[in-house]
Each structure stands twice: as C-alpha cells, then as structure tokens.
C-alpha cells in the first residue's frame, strides 16, 4: 500500500476507460459508514465521485454530483440528494455518512453539514465491493459511461465503518483525519487503469 499524503489522482480527460480501483478486504456488510475526500473539477455536467458496486448490485453505494450545488448518495439503488450553495469551479471537501438503524444520510461540504435525508433504513451495504474512482460502474467493476466520468482531481480519501461525530468530520476537513479502517489515503491499495496520473495536491 502507498502513503498518498499530499498527493492526488488526476483524471485529465473525459473517457470511458480511465479509472482507479480502490482495494479493500471488507468482509462484512456495512451498517454504518463515513466517507471523506477532496475533489476539484470544472465539470458542470453530472459525474460520479465514488462508485461502490457488489456482485450483481449496481449503485450499492454511489456518491454522485448531479450539478453544481447538488450531491446525491445512492444506497442499494435508492437515492437522496442534498443541496448547497457553492462556488464553481472550486475545490471541495466532501464527507458523507449513512447509518442503517435510522437510515439517516448526511453530507458535509467544506466542514458544513447539509440537511439530513433518510433512505434504506435497516439495509446493510453488501461487502466485497469493487470501488472505482473516475467512472460510474453499471456492473461489478465495469460498464462505464463517458457522460458520467470524472475529470479533475481527487485526494485525501478516507472511509470508516462508523458514523463519525462532527468533530472528527471537521478534523478530516482540516487535514488531520482519524485512522480509517476501510480506505485510508495514507495506506492505500489501488490500481490505476488508463490515463490517471498521481500529482502533488496544490489546491488546499
């Protein structure tokens, strides 16, 4: 695994091929999670930010930007969308958490919580995922669509199997995240596929 501190994945072009596979040994279904990362893109169309599919289950967990100021979370093919006033184009720190017992999903954009939404109460997110950055999966690890591809930079990605309290979300935003037990930017197992370049993070 690699310590990617101070670095980003750069997706320099629109494509149907360029992506990064993130590898995790996640063996048990997720009842809760928090996902945080930084992104910088000047796309005004919709695109996938984080695509997590399991065998036979599309959009098991998907973070998707619908348009400027609109972020969606899919859990088990169900969707909620939260809105925020944001500058465009501008770097953004995104966290999203979801809790099975309540179904509550919450986005945090640049350290500010958006309106909580609810979906898939009681559902468990399946384990043994294929996790893809840069493309939106329509199958288990494949079937990409150019019109949903990400062009830009992604870094500081962490994923925990718990709902982090606000002070830990703010720590991640400020650049001092807790150690993460699903995906950790400081100890990341990944595979680059296609034209994706690792470069220094210069926009934080």
């Amino acid at each position: 695994h690699t310590d990617l501190s101070g670095k980003v994945f750069v997706f320099p072009r629109e494509s149907v091929t360029d992506h990064v596979n993130l590898i995790t040994p996640l063996e048990k279904p997720l009842q809760n999670f928090t996902l945080c990362f930084r992104a910088y893109s000047d796309l005004s169309r919709a695109y996938s930010l984080f695509s997590y599919n399991t065998q036979g289950r599309d959009n098991e967990l998907l973070v998707y930007k619908e348009r400027v100021g609109e972020y969606s979370l899919y859990i088990g093919r169900h969707k909620v969308t939260s809105k925020v006033i944001e500058k465009f184009p501008a770097p953004v720190h995104i966290c999203v958490s979801w809790e099975s017992s309540s179904g509550i999903a919450e986005f945090w954009i640049n350290g500010t919580p958006l309106v909580k939404k609810g979906l898939r109460q009681g559902y468990f997110v399946e384990a043994q995922p294929k996790i893809v950055l840069g493309q939106e999966q329509d199958s288990y690890g494949g079937k990409f669509d150019r019109s949903q591809s990400f062009v830009g930079e992604i870094g500081d990605l962490y994923m925990w199997d718990s709902v982090l309290p606000p002070e830990n979300i703010l720590s991640a935003y400020q650049g001092t995240p807790l150690p993460a037990n699903i995906l950790d930017w400081q100890a990341l197992n990944y595979e680059i596929r296609g034209y994706v370049i690792i470069k220094p993070l210069v926009w934080v």
């Epitope: 310590d3 101070g6 807790l178 037990n181 400081q186 100890a187």
Partner: antibody
C-alpha cells in the same frame, strides 16, 4: 520470511541520545508503515509514533514529539528511532512493528532493544 | 488520549479452563481494537484484530467480541502455551493506546 531485526542493547547517560535501528527483510520495506512502541520494565506498551518509508511521512505521539525522531534508510531497508534528552524513565525495551496490510494493527514485531538510562 | 482499561490485571487458571479478559475504552472506539499475546522476553504477537477477527495462524480457541467501549478476549480451553500476558490496543484515534495488560498464570 518477513522479519524485523533490531540493534543490540544500549546503556546511556541521562541527557544523552540513543538511536535504535530496525532492519526489515522478506517484504517491500517502502510499502508498509513502521511503528515504534516501548515497554518499561514490568509495564505495558506505549506507542511512540510511525513513519512511512516511501513518503517519509511521520505521526508522533504528542508525548514524544519533542524528543523522538523517526527516520528510514530505504537503501538498506532500515528504520531508525532516535530519542534525545534521555532520563531514567526512558529505560525500556523499544520495539519496531510493521503495520498490517489493511488495518492499523501491528502484525510483525522486532525482537526489541533494551535501552538502559543510568548515571 | 483514549484510556484502555483491562480487567483483571492478573488471573490464575488451569489447563482446559475457559478464560475471559475484558477491555474498556474511555470513549467509543467502534470495532478498532486488537488483542496481543506477549511471553516474557519476547515481542507481542497479534491474535485478534477489528475486535473479532482472528489473525492468520491463531488457534480457533481464541475469540474476540465487542464494539464501542467494551471488548472481550475469550480463550475457550486454555492450553499450556497460552500462559502469557495479553494486551488490548485501540487504533480508532491517535495516539494508539494499549491496555495495561492481563497476566494469565497457571493455577
């Protein structure tokens, strides 16, 4: 097999420094965080800090931040822990330990280095 | 810093006994807890990670459970080689912290 071999025991005077080495073999040294943990005689375990050999990124326990320095030599697959301004309470066995593949646990440990601080 | 409090601090038991050691965290650490075994003059060995997963090569008589603040290590049937000191460790927050240890002795 995966192994961490540490340097031998040291006796130091109060106020001096000690540098303990940890030579890795049997795996890709630059791909795993290396941690340092100490154990005072008859006491529990205390985390000092960690270093990633490739990025040389470090993270220290606040308690040791001003006195501990973690370094690596990639060419020899060796990690080092230097502790300065030694006092008698620094007498302990110092261990290096490798971070597990996917989790923040320690799956391979060195044999330990006893550092005795005495005037 | 998160305090990890183990109990008991020492324990006498016989071969074949079922033994339980507990570890209490001073705040929520989710399931980010490991258990180590240490014998005199040796380095610790990883037994259990993520509260309940046995590390490779660890006998099935060792099991772990718990989440949040309360964790348990159970040895279902003590073997002679199990007499040692056991430590819990949290890696939910920096700095990583350990319990003070539980010394398991032969009765």
């Amino acid at each position: 097999q995966v192994q961490l071999v540490q340097s031998g025991a040291e006796v130091k005077k109060p106020g001096s420094s000690v540098k303990v080495s940890c030579k890795a073999s049997g795996y890709t040294f630059t791909s795993y965080w290396m941690h340092w943990v100490r154990q005072a005689p008859g006491q529990g375990l205390e985390w000092i800090g960690m270093i990633h050999p490739n990025s040389v990124n470090t993270n220290y326990n606040e308690k040791f931040k001003s006195r501990a320095t973690l370094t690596v030599d990639k060419s020899t697959s060796t990690a080092y822990m230097e502790l300065s301004s030694l006092r008698s309470e620094d007498t302990a066995v110092y261990y290096c330990a490798r971070r597990n593949d996917y989790y923040w646990y320690f799956d391979v440990w060195g044999q330990g280095t006893l550092v005795t601080v005495s005037s | 810093d998160i305090q990890m409090t183990q109990s008991p601090s020492s324990l006498s038991a016989s071969v074949g006994d079922r033994v339980t050691i507990t570890c209490k965290a001073s705040q929520n650490v989710n399931s980010n807890v490991a258990w180590y075994q240490q014998k005199p003059g040796k380095a610790p060995k990883l037994l259990i990670y993520s509260a309940s997963y046995r590390y490779s090569g660890v006998p099935s008589r060792f099991s772990g459970s718990g989440s949040g603040t309360d964790f348990t290590l159970t040895i279902s049937s003590l073997q002679p080689e199990d007499f040692a000191t056991y430590y819990c460790q949290q890696c939910n927050n920096y700095p990583f912290t350990f319990g003070q240890g539980t010394k398991l002795e032969i009765k």
